[in-house]
Each structure stands twice: as C-alpha cells, then as structure tokens.
C-alpha cells in the first residue's frame, strides 16, 4: 500500500489555445486530469487501473502551481494504491480548458483538450522528487512525480506492513526496510522480552521490564545471587535455597540450640569465667571467694578452691593469688587456647588438632554432622518409601518397612501375593488390597485351605437297628458298626433272614 | 524466641512524613532478607517493601515506589521504613515480618498503625 | 499481578469439625503458596509454606495440599482456638500476593 504523487510545478500555453489550435475565451481556465496505470509499452486509452485524479482550475493560459493549491485542490496530487508497487507505470497527464463551473467530462465539448502527454517506465519507492518536462507544439508542462509507501507500510514495493508499538505485545519502531527495531531494553523477534538488569543471575533472576532483576522462589539481592535461609532457621546461613547452615555457636535442625550459652547469655556472676559444655549448658569457674551454679554466692578466699587446671591457691590480704601449671593463664589460670583438650565434639566425635593445637576438627561418627557433630542426621526426610512404606533410620544407613503387597528397597514394586500358590488343598487365591484370600474346597478351611473339616457323613443317621455310625474321614462316608444280630451296610438286615 | 517490634506509627497529614522502626531479636538479623505489610482497616494483607540481606537491595510494591524508602542497620538488628508524601489510602496497620517478596513471611510484629487524615 | 481468590469468604462451623478451605490463583504458581492465620489485633501467624509444609510449631491437625492454580486448607478437628481468618498467599510471581481472606466462626 502506498500513494503515486504528482507535483504540477509549472504549465505554459502562451498563446492561450487548446489543441485544436483554436484560442481560448477569453483565456484558457486550466485543470488537468491525471491517469496513472499499469505499464505499457505504448500507453493507450483504457482504464486507469491504479488510479485517477482530476484537479479543479488551476490558472488560466501559463502560470505556476504553488504546493497544496488554494480552491480545494491538493499538490501534489495523490494517487494512492493499495497492492504491491510493481516498480513499472505509466502515466497520462491531460490539460483542459473549463467554459464553466462543471468539469465533469460528459459536461466539458470534446475539444477543450488544451493538451495531453503520456510517459511510463520504472520508478523505485522513494522520498526523492523525479522531475520531468514535457514540451508540445503550443505547450510545455513541468512536474515531478515520486512514490512513497503508506503509514505503517515499508520495503521495496511498500508490501511489509509494520506499525509502531510499546505496549504488551511488543516495544519498537520500524526500520526503513518494514524490519522491527526494539525500543532500548526490549530484545526478541518482536521485541517483547525485556532486557534485564546487566548482571542479573541467569537461572534465579528474571525481569518483567527492563533494567529488572526480580528473583526466583529462594534468592535474593540485586543480582539474585544470594540464597535465603530456611523459613525456620534462627542463627544459620544458606549456601542454597532454604538451607541452615549454622553459625559458629549454634547448632540444631534450625539452628536454634544455643552451644555458646556463655557468649549469648552471660549466665557467670561475680567475674566468674563460663565454658560451654553442650546444648543450652555452661559450667561457671568461679573467682576466688564465690561458688554456686552461677558463682553467686560469697565464699572466702582460698575456700573455693579458684584456681583451675591444677593452680595451687595463695591466700593474701587483698584475697588471692593462683601459681599456674604449664600451659595455663589467667586469674584462675582459666584460659588455654580452645583445643581438643576442651572436649568439643558431641555425641561421640572424635577431636583433631589443627594448626599446632590452635584450633581443632571434629569427625563425626555416622548418624551425626555439623562443626561440632551436634546434629543428627535423619536420612528419612526426603520421604524416599513408596506405597506407604515406613522409613527407618538404621545408623548411618535407612531402610523401608513395606505394606503388604509391596517389595523391594524402596518398597516400590507390587508383590502378587497369589504368586507363590499359597492355597493349600486346590482352594482358589483371590489377590486384595489388603492381602490375599483363599476360597477352599468343601472339606477343608483356614486361611490357606490347611485345615481339614471333617463332613459329618452321619449326620441323616443313616444306620438302622441302633447301629453305631461313624465317618470314614479319607472318603467322607458313614460306615456302620452293627449290633448282634443284624448284617448289612446299614446293618438293615437281621442275622438268618438275608436279602431275598 | 524471635522478636519484632514495630514503633513509629501515629496520625499525619496527607502529603506528610512518617519514620517506622523495627528492633529484631531472636535470630542473626544480617542472615535474612526483611518485608513489610500492611493492612487497611478491615481489609486483607498487602506487601509493601522488601530488603535482601546480602547486600540491602529494596523492592517496593508500584504504588509505593517513589515515596517510602526500606533500609536496615544490621549492627543494630534493626528494619526502616521512611514514608513521605503520605495517601489516605496508606493508611494500615503496617508489619515488619521476616521474608522476601519470594518467600513466605515466617515472623512478624505486632504492627504499629499509621494514619494519614487532615 | 496475580490474583488469589479464597473461598468461603467466611464459613461457620463446631468444634471437633473437618473444615476446608480453598484458594485459587490466576495463574500458575507451582507449589510456591502460604497460609497464614489472623486473629482479631494481632499479627498474622505462618501456617503452611510450599503448599504443605507445617511451619515450626503448627499443630499436625492442619494440613495443606494442592499445586499449580488451586489450593487447599485443611483443619481435620477444629479446636476452640483455631476460630480466626485465613490468608493464602502466593511467592512465586513478584509482587507477592495475597487472598482476601476466610473468616471462620463458630457456629
């Protein structure tokens, strides 16, 4: 889609006649028709296929067309199309002369032509004027003619169609070409992806706008490559998302178990020097002259026995005085570098010097982890039985109690209970959820067939004479024990008077 | 036991300022990223603001940006929230809670009310 | 901004009661979803983070499921304590948001 522009700059008919050669009355009222069609090798007659304009009068005889023309008429004239430019035209340009107001074609005489003129060729898309001029007999007509592209249509031939937009389909502007060119910030082949904060973290960070980080569940910071902390953690960090990595002093699941109780709460009086001994436990060495718990009772001097780590005690006037061992210092000869010789590791750890005794490392024995081998470790918390198994911890290792019906490591794989033929006595196995069931053969019971039920052969007496019936229980027949006197299966015959 | 304790709130005049505290305890404040919310009278919860903990890095929600201002003072174990050009419509009752606008807001405060009339 | 709608808005029940409660939102936010208590002039209190997680200290009688848009709560025996409102509250999409709330009452 574009528009053919015609600028009339100039036209001259000096002697005021038209193409007949016959003069004008009183002088030649100008107006032109313009054609504009397809190309044609020799321009002829016929529609104008890509449009036509008719300008109202311009000037009489010869004068010059000022752009955008007073008394209605626009220059340049607008010859818009709606297709594809084909590159090629051809175009008639046709001067008349108005006797009146009405310029219609049916209502001007055949002879008012003053003038006619036809070119064609190729013309490119452009913003750049081709001028021309065209000179007859009697006439000469100026012009300059171009073709430019509608709003919103780009390219060669004005066939892309692009139009400007920042909103939530896309942020550009278009380039010459119809091609998309992003707003600053915007990237993506329609320019809707926001370019984010320049450092932002690939995976953790996002942005919904430009220059944006925004993080993901479980970062933050500026560059969303900081993680956040357990939801439950107190006194711990993080190395990946929702982690409680504890600081020095705290141990527990959360982090909430206070291994530093003499830091945290001061719980010594009187001076008195406080060594942690485990979770939320401490132990206070008091000054000389105080005891209890917390080294808030008075004693006298030496009494107390003050001094620590085998100091001897020296009474003085002003109180006392501690002669340390080796290796000791302080008032109380309390203080040695923190080393193993403080029994640091818990449940079991065993203790390593490092740096010549100025520091130390635990090694935990299975089950237990941390600094300070503090925390238990419970192997069951990713939930790893399936089918409602139940998780163990078993040591440094778990293990999965199966539901009926369920088998292997993770109780992950269905055990046909009938599998294994378990009806005994041809009974029938029926695999449920909640185990199998045998249904048994007459004469036998039990939850697996296993029970043989005698079936009680006398129970329709089937002996007479007051025989005695009993049930043969390996062909579940009655067998009569007959009485003196009588014979027969059912002892029905007396002794003497046999069957007839 | 964690701790947090909002001070700071009262009355102001639309177009006024306002300074609300937040003291912590209870925990390594330097550990984590802090929020607050707030509530209208009557209403639901509405997040506010957000600092990291890493490096102090603010988030506010749209309505906000522009005239409140979180920060932190981590040796003091203590959360800001400086709100000027004061809207009816900031008044609530505002939190401080533990948390980041990705991640649940484990533990709050009591909450301090602020109101913005003339 | 993701919208989280909660319903009943309010819900009257006893003691001893199974209560449910739902929450949906407009979008997508995995399993990235909180439940928060609230009774009359104090602070909101952590339930249930990432759907059905109990935070420390939320007794086993409440429990939470779902994923995705839809989402539930649920309290298998009301206890004369748990009469408060409830928020849902999404984390996956900033900004955070939040349901407008259930009040349940006693009935």
């Known amino acids: 889609s574009g528009v053919f522009q015609l600028q009339l700059q100039e036209f001259v008919n000096e002697r005021g006649v038209l193409a007949s050669g016959r003069p004008c009355e009183p002088g030649c009222r100008t107006f032109f028709r313009v054609c504009l069609k397809h190309f044609q090798a020799v321009v002829s007659p016929g529609p104008c296929t890509f449009g036509s304009v008719s300008t109202p009068v311009l000037g009489t005889n010869s004068f010059a067309v000022r752009d955008d023309s007073s008394g209605g008429g626009r220059n340049p004239l607008q010859l818009p199309f709606n297709f594809t430019w084909p590159g090629t035209f051809s175009l008639i340009i046709e001067a008349w002369h108005a006797p009146g107001d009405d310029l219609r074609p049916e209502a001007l005489p055949p002879d008012a032509l003053i003038s006619k003129i036809a070119i064609q060729g190729s013309l490119a898309v452009g913003q750049n004027w081709l001028l021309d001029e065209q000179t007859s007999t009697l006439t000469r007509l100026r012009y300059s003619y171009r073709v430019i592209c509608s709003d919103n249509y780009y390219g060669d031939n004005c066939s892309r169609l692009c139009k400007k937009r920042n909103d939530h389909f896309g942020h550009y502007v278009c380039q010459p070409d119809g091609n998309l060119s992003c707003l600053p910030g915007w990237t993506g082949e329609y320019c809707q992806q926001p370019i984010c904060l320049s450092g932002c973290h690939e995976q953790n960070g996002y942005c919904s706008k430009p220059a944006e980080c925004l993080c993901r569940p479980g970062w933050q910071g500026r560059l969303c490559n900081e993680c956040i902390p357990h939801n439950g953690c107190r006194h711990g960090t993080c190395s990946t998302p929702w982690q409680c990595t504890c600081d020095e002093g705290w141990g527990g699941l959360f982090c909430d178990q206070d291994l530093n109780y003499c830091t945290h709460h001061s719980p010594c009086k009187n001076g008195a020097t406080c060594s942690n001994s485990g979770q939320r436990s401490y132990t206070c060495t008091c000054r000389p002259g105080y005891t209890g718990v917390d080294c808030e009772l008075e004693l006298s001097e030496c009494d107390s026995n003050p001094c620590r780590n085998g100091g001897s005690c020296k009474d003085q006037e002003d109180g006392y005085h501690c002669l340390c061992p080796p290796g000791y210092y302080g008032l109380h000869c309390e203080h040695s570098t923190l080393s193993c010789a403080d029994s640091p590791c818990f449940n079991g750890g065993s203790c390593r010097e490092r740096n010549q005794g100025a520091s130390y490392a635990c090694e935990c024995p299975p089950n237990f982890t941390g600094s300070n081998c503090e925390k238990k470790v419970d192997r069951c918390t990713s939930n790893p039985c399936a089918n409602g198994g139940q998780c163990l911890n078993r040591g440094p290792s778990r293990m999965c109690r199966c539901r009926p019906g369920f088998t292997g490591t993770y109780c992950e794989r269905h055990v046909s209970d009938c599998a294994r033929n378990p009806c005994a006595h041809g009974g029938t196995c029926h695999d449920l959820e909640s185990g199998l069931m045998c249904t048994c053969p007459a004469g036998f019971s039990g939850r697996r067939c296993e029970v043989r039920t005698s079936i009680d052969a006398c129970a329709s007496s089937p002996c007479f004479n007051r025989a005695t019936c009993y049930t043969d229980l390996s062909t579940d027949t009655f067998v009569c024990n007959c009485p003196y006197g009588f014979v027969g299966s059912r002892c029905e015959f007396p002794v003497g008077l046999p069957p007839s | 036991e964690v701790q947090l304790v909002e001070s700071g709130g009262g009355l102001v005049q639309p177009g006024g300022s306002l300074r609300l505290s937040c003291a912590a305890s209870g925990f390594t404040f330097r550990n984590f990223p802090m929020a607050w919310v707030r509530q209208a009278p009557g209403k639901g919860l509405e997040w506010v603001a957000t600092?990291?903990?890493?490096?102090?890095?603010?988030t506010y929600r749209d309505s906000v940006k522009g005239r409140f201002t979180i920060s932190r003072d981590n040796a003091k174990s203590s959360l800001y929230l400086q709100m000027n050009s004061l809207r009816a419509e900031d008044t609530a009752v505002y939190y401080c809670?533990?948390?980041?606008?990705?991640?649940?807001?484990?533990?709050w405060g009591q909450g301090t009310l602020v109101t913005v009339s003339s | 901004d993701i919208q989280m709608t909660q319903s009943p808005s309010s819900l009257s029940a006893s003691v001893g009661d199974r209560v449910t409660i739902t929450c949906r939102a407009s979008?997508?936010?995995?399993?990235?979803l909180a439940w928060y208590q609230q009774k009359p002039g104090k602070a909101p209190k952590l339930l249930i983070y990432?759907?059905?997680n109990l935070a420390d200290g939320v007794p086993s009688r409440f429990s939470g499921s779902g994923s995705g848009t839809d989402f539930t709560l649920t309290i298998s025996s009301l206890q004369p304590e748990d009469f408060a409102t409830y928020y849902c509250?999404?984390?996956?999409?900033?900004?955070?948001?939040f349901g407008q709330g259930t009040k349940l009452e006693i009935k």
């Open positions: 809670s533990r948390g980041y606008y990705n991640s649940p807001f484990a533990y």
């Open positions: 509250q999404q984390y996956n999409n900033y900004p955070p948001t």
């Open positions: 600092i990291s903990s890493s490096d102090g890095w603010p």
């Open positions: 990432d759907t059905n």
């Open positions: 979008e997508d936010i995995y399993s990235n």
